[in-house]
């Protein structure tokens, strides 16, 4: 049943959810945690359970991608009566428990964030011993990793009829806007390809026809910063030399 606690300040927002006679299983996580690549982030997770004063063995687990089936990125186990949760798995050594599972807190710290860490994470606790029970967050917490632009590839490629085209690929979050500048170009926002499937932070811009020799510069910019890189086109004897 639901009981609304009205304290003397008449605060109605703190509605406590109870199941008779004890608390039911629930897990509380925020919708999202946002952090910059290279920094650390805390993924909060607290839980309630119906087993009052449970003191037996427990395991805390975090998985990525999807609940119940996603790969584990962290796991620790605490022996009966122990407040110390011994780490059994920490993917790439970057995950560590910040909370205290004995006190209903499974919060996890993730170090040295990368764009690839941008996904949903799910906390889970398992009781073993006199009581066998387990619970996992269904919706999880989304880790939103932001990053200043970085140009990962810039190149000049031959195209039909002895012409050349330039490609620039950059990563960043928010996805960066790309612009080309160069001989007789001024500053042109080149045709931008949509981020590739499975590469949500990568954006590619193409200059379809390079008509003049010289230096072509690709600039990537988002709210966190900008980056640029150049290629040089020199045509001689029907061939091209391109360098970055």
């Amino acid at each position: 049943f639901v009981r609304t606690k009205i304290d003397t300040t008449e605060n109605l927002l703190n509605t406590e959810v109870h199941s008779s006679p004890a608390q039911r299983w629930s897990m509380q996580v925020p919708p999202e945690v946002s952090a910059e690549a290279g920094d650390a982030a805390v993924l909060p997770c607290t839980f309630t359970h119906p087993h009052r004063h449970y003191d037996g063995p427990l395991t805390a687990i975090w998985r990525a991608g999807e609940p119940y089936a996603g790969p584990q990125v962290f796991r620790c186990a605490a022996a009966r009566g122990s407040e110390l949760c011994q780490t059994a798995l920490s993917l790439h050594g970057r995950f560590r428990l910040l909370g205290n599972p004995r006190r209903n807190d499974l919060s996890l710290r993730v170090e040295r964030l990368a764009l690839a860490d941008d996904r949903r994470y799910f906390c889970r606790v398992e009781f073993a011993g006199d009581v066998h029970d387990r619970y996992e967050s269904r919706h999880g917490v989304r880790l939103h990793v932001t990053a200043a632009p970085r140009i990962v590839n810039i190149s000049v490629l031959p195209s039909p009829a002895h012409a050349f085209r330039a490609l620039c690929t950059a990563e960043g979050e928010p996805p960066p806007a790309l612009a080309w500048s160069g001989p007789a170009l001024g500053n042109s926002l080149a045709a931008v390809r949509s981020p590739r499937e499975g590469h949500g932070h990568l954006v590619t811009a193409e200059l379809p026809a390079l008509t003049h020799d010289g230096r072509y510069t690709c600039t990537a910019a988002n709210s966190l910063g900008r980056s640029e890189a150049s290629v040089y086109l020199f045509r001689f004897h029907g061939a091209s030399g391109a360098s970055t």
Epitope: N11, V42, T48, G99, N100
Partner: antibody, heavy 124, light 113 residues
Framework: QVQLVQSGAEVKKPGASVKVSCKAS????????MHWVRQAPGQGLEWMGW????????NYAQRFQGRVTMTRDTSISTAYMELSRLRSDDTAVYYC?????????????????WGQGTSVTVSS | DIVMTQSPDSLAVSLGERATINCKSS????????????LAWYQQKPGQPPKLLIY???TRESGVPDRFSGSGSGTDFTLTISSLQAEDVAVYYC?????????FGQGTKLEIK
């Protein structure tokens, strides 16, 4: 009634540390997050982080990482916020504020009770 | 981080008239899993700490007069005071609690015309 009472005003020199206390009454201290929010003179509100008094778990805003430490003493229902390596731009009023009810199933992390604020002046 | 932008920065309204303050978030604070907007409004009077007015974008905190109402969804939100009273002179802040770190708008100063 719910009350958060903070320690008095402080004047510090650059490079020093300050520790502000926040004594809670009128509710179960370990049932709610405690947030710290600061407000520079004539400016808006800036969230610094929280402590979960039940587990002692903390979460700090990135810009304060390495300089802020939030602790609590459950025996006297008091939360503390220590800020080190003070600079002149740390001059502000620092507030503690009660946050989410830990047992509530939705992430309703609004600040429904606030301390009176502690003025911290950093000046050489 | 989610950036919260309020408009206008200041507002002068006659007593008894309607006051409207807007808040825009740089990304949506609507959570599809429960269809709730993780947005709150606070009132801060001079020399006082902030006071919670509204949460879930439109739910009034107990004890808050019903002339205060919140609306909006996704990225665009509004705090409305239907009939301005002298005691409503304050700075009003929106805050998102969808994404950590939590962020506030820069504030809107409400005065009497």
């Amino acid at each position: 009634q719910v009350q958060l009472v903070q320690s008095g005003a402080e004047v510090k020199k650059p490079g020093a540390s300050v520790k502000v206390s926040c004594k809670a009454s009128g509710y179960t201290f370990t049932d709610y997050y405690m947030h710290w929010v600061r407000q520079a003179p004539g400016q808006g509100l800036e969230w610094m982080g929280w402590i979960n008094p039940n587990s002692d778990g903390t979460n700090y805003a990135q810009r304060f990482q390495g300089r802020v430490t939030m602790t609590r003493d459950t025996s006297i229902s008091t939360a503390y916020m220590e800020l080190s390596r003070l600079r002149s731009d740390d001059t502000a009023v620092y507030y503690c504020a009660r946050g989410r009810l830990l047992r509530f199933f939705d992430w309703l992390d609004v600040m429904d009770a606030w301390g009176q604020g502690t003025s911290v002046t950093v000046s050489s | 981080d989610i950036v919260m932008t309020q408009s206008p920065d200041s507002l002068a309204v006659s007593l008894g008239e309607r006051a409207t303050i807007n808040c825009k978030s740089s990304r949506s604070v609507l959570y599809s899993s429960n269809n709730k907007n993780y947005l709150a409004w606070y009132q801060q009077k001079p020399g006082q700490p902030p006071k919670l007015l509204i949460y879930w974008a439109s739910t009034r905190e107990s004890g808050v007069p019903d002339r205060f109402s919140g609306s909006g969804s996704g990225t665009d939100f509004t705090l409305t005071i239907s009939s301005l009273q002298a005691e409503d002179v304050a700075v009003y802040y929106c805050q998102q609690y969808y994404s950590i770190p939590y962020t506030f708008g820069q504030g809107t100063k409400l005065e009497i015309k």
